[in-house]
């Protein structure tokens, strides 16, 4: 195909791919009609003057995962049709000024995963048609004012995984078309007021894994089109009352892995489109009434691994669309009987790893669609009669690692569990803690005849009548109580893919496979 170099493969579609450690220079001659050229995994260390001179029709050029450390300023001369240029995963420390001169059609420039120490305004001043600029995974310590001033058509800018300690409030001011800005995994400690004011079309802002301690009250006030805001794994200890006030399009907000002690009233809203709110791994101790009441479309609320000891009965007011509520690994001892009454569409609730000693009999009264309830590793000795009766869709109920008191009061629960064993899962079953003579025996098959009679008087209607089998033998303890130790590394809330990918560490928010999707 018009002279394909021996080290390369050339397809009919004018695509050329050159790979292999034996390649130490740009192969020649390259087919004059090549439109796509990939040079991958070679030992090329430098690009000299005009190695692509005879392939002026080239549209896409990928020079990735090589040993490339030096580029001559005229290396890309005569590539006026080039739209996509990737130099990612090389060893570039310096970019020569004028390197991209003449690349008038360039739309995507990928410089990620190199060793770049600085960028200058002159580097990109010729790239007026650039839409995507990837600079993540370099060693950039600061971005000079004017660096992006000529990139007025830019829609995606990735500066993540660098060593940025501060950002000038003027550096993004001309990027009115920017839709995605990623600054994750840097060393930013604060972001000046006005930094994002010019980004009126911004849809995604990734600030996670920095060292941000304080957010300016009006930091996001001009970003009315923002849909995804990632603030997780920073040092944020408080949220200014109005910081999220002007974000009507926001649908995902991650704040996990910060130092939030309280959620100030009205902080979330109005955000009519917010679907997911991630608040795990903070220091929140209580939830007042109406704290989420502006989040009418919220479907996922993750509050696990905080220090919540009190939830006001109206804390979840307004969350009529909520599907997932994670409250596991907190310090809850009591729940008011009204606390979940507004959550008509709730499907999954995780309350494991708390200190709950009892549950109100009507705690799930209005939550008829519940499919999964996690109650393991609490201080429950019994459950109110009929607590699960109306939950026709319940298919997962975890009750193990509680100090069940197997006296005659436990019979209605025992009988209900007997009929609903599949819902308990097979990994670990609830076992008796007291009286001592039945400790460690399965709650489901225990012979309550040998237990101590109860003096407790039930207050609410009983479970549906089910047979009690007094002749069921007492079994020795064959059930090992599973450890409830969880993985404590937080879930990556962000990768460089536009779609967020979730690892399989579902334990962080206590969801099932189906829930985490």
């Amino acid at each position: 195909y018009h002279g394909c170099p021996s080290e390369c493969t050339c397809s009919r579609a004018s695509q050329v791919e050159c790979t292999g450690a034996r390649i130490v220079a740009v192969p020649t001659p390259l087919p004059w009609n090549a439109m796509s050229l990939q040079i991958l995994n070679t030992h090329i260390t430098e690009l000299n003057e005009s190695p692509f001179l005879n392939i002026s029709a080239l549209i896409a050029l990928r020079i990735e995962k090589n040993e490339l450390s030096r580029i001559t300023p005229g290396a890309f001369r005569n590539l006026g049709s080039l739209r996509y240029l990737s130099l990612a995963n090389n060893k570039l420390q310096v970019l020569p000024i004028g390197l991209f001169q003449g690349l008038d059609s360039l739309e995507s420039l990928l410089l990620s995963s190199n060793q770049l120490l600085q960028i200058q305004p002159a580097h990109f001043s010729q790239c007026s048609n650039l839409k995507e600029l990837q600079l993540h995974g370099n060693h950039l310590e600061y971005i000079p004012d004017g660096a992006f001033d000529h990139l007025v058509g830019l829609t995606k800018l990735n500066l993540g995984k660098n060593s940025l300690t501060h950002i000038s409030p003027r550096v993004f001011q001309h990027l009115g078309n920017l839709q995605v800005l990623r600054l994750y995994e840097n060393r930013l400690t604060d972001i000046p007021m006005g930094t994002f004011d010019g980004l009126v079309n911004l849809q995604e802002l990734a600030l996670q894994q920095n060292q941000i301690g304080l957010l300016s009250p009006g930091l996001f006030h001009n970003n009315h089109n923002l849909q995804r805001l990632y603030l997780s794994n920073n040092h944020i200890s408080q949220l200014p009352p109005s910081v999220f006030m002007q974000l009507p399009q926001l649908n995902r907000l991650t704040l996990f892995g910060n130092s939030l002690k309280e959620l100030s009233p009205g902080i979330f809203g109005p955000m009519p489109n917010l679907r997911e709110l991630w608040l795990y791994d903070n220091h929140i101790s209580s939830l007042p009434d109406n704290v989420f009441s502006n989040l009418r479309q919220l479907q996922v609320l993750i509050l696990s691994r905080n220090q919540i000891s009190f939830i006001s009965p109206g804390a979840f007011n307004g969350l009529t669309e909520l599907r997932e509520l994670s409250l596991h690994t907190n310090a809850l001892q009591d729940l008011d009987g009204n606390v979940f009454r507004m959550l008509a569409n709730l499907q999954n609730i995780s309350l494991q790893n708390n200190r709950l000693r009892q549950l109100p009999g009507n705690i799930f009264a209005n939550v008829n669609g519940l499919m999964a309830i996690q109650l393991q590793n609490n201080q429950l000795e019994n459950l109110p009669l009929g607590i699960f009766d109306h939950l026709g869709k319940l298919c997962e109920l975890r009750l193990y690692d509680n100090p069940w008191r197997c006296d005659s009061d436990i019979l209605p629960l025992r009988n209900w569990l007997l009929l609903n064993q599949p819902r308990l899962g097979t990994d670990t079953v609830p076992v008796c803690f007291s009286p001592a003579n039945v400790r460690g025996q399965s709650l489901i098959i225990i012979n309550v005849n040998v237990a101590v009679p109860s003096v407790h008087v039930p207050e609410v209607p009983s479970y549906p009548e089910t047979p009690w089998y007094p002749d069921t033998p007492s079994y020795p303890d064959t059930t090992s109580v599973s450890s409830t130790t969880e993985l404590t590394s937080p879930v990556e809330d962000y990768t460089d893919l536009t779609t967020i990918q979730v690892t399989d560490d579902r334990s962080v928010w206590g969801m099932t496979q189906a829930q985490s999707g």
Partner: antibody
Framework: QVQLQQSGPELVRPGASVKISCKAS????????INWVKQRPGQGLEWIGW????????KYNEKFKGKATLTVDTSSSTTYMQLSSLTSEDSAVYFC???????????WGQGTLVTVSS | DIQMTQSPSSLSASVGDRVTITCKAS??????VAWYQQKPGKAPKLLIY???YRSSGVPSRFSGSGSGTDFTLTISSLQPEDFATYYC?????????FGGGTKVEIK
Amino acid sequence: QVQLQQSGPELVRPGASVKISCKASGYTFTDYYINWVKQRPGQGLEWIGWIYPGSGNTKYNEKFKGKATLTVDTSSSTTYMQLSSLTSEDSAVYFCTKWGYGAWFAYWGQGTLVTVSS
Amino acid sequence: DIQMTQSPSSLSASVGDRVTITCKASQNVGINVAWYQQKPGKAPKLLIYSASYRSSGVPSRFSGSGSGTDFTLTISSLQPEDFATYYCQQYNSFPYTFGGGTKVEIK
């Protein structure tokens, strides 16, 4: 319907203690927090604290720590408040209250007048 | 502690008058404010919760508004049975606190 019935008026000496009660009916007593509120004659209202009858857990206004002690008897659906080391400042009407669907006081007892006088 | 400053402390009005009572919180309490009516020798009665929601059985002439730090109780047309003392209360953070009260008297 929810009802909170409080014990009658008390006349007590300075330095003494008094224990007043609040009997709940019309709902499952152990499932909902009970709060106590103080009102001095001709004055405003002060929140003393809450108790969760199902566990006996309490939370107090710092101002009333050491002064008020909240307890519960689930068998009689009754909450108690003991006031100790009484002074004339403790002369007041004390109300027990139950929250509604939020932390507002939807239901009130009729009040118990405590008079501290020698 | 959050201070709830109520004003006026008293007012004189006639039947049919429009009466407005304000309450200012010393810090942001969102919409977590309730209003109560109390008559002599009686327990307070809940009128308004979550700043603007009328409690069941409360006449429509009573309305509440506000959020953050500034709240208002309005009686659109004062009736003879409305002469009483009115209290605001914040329940956003512990300790829960009340305003000093507004006594509505007959002119």
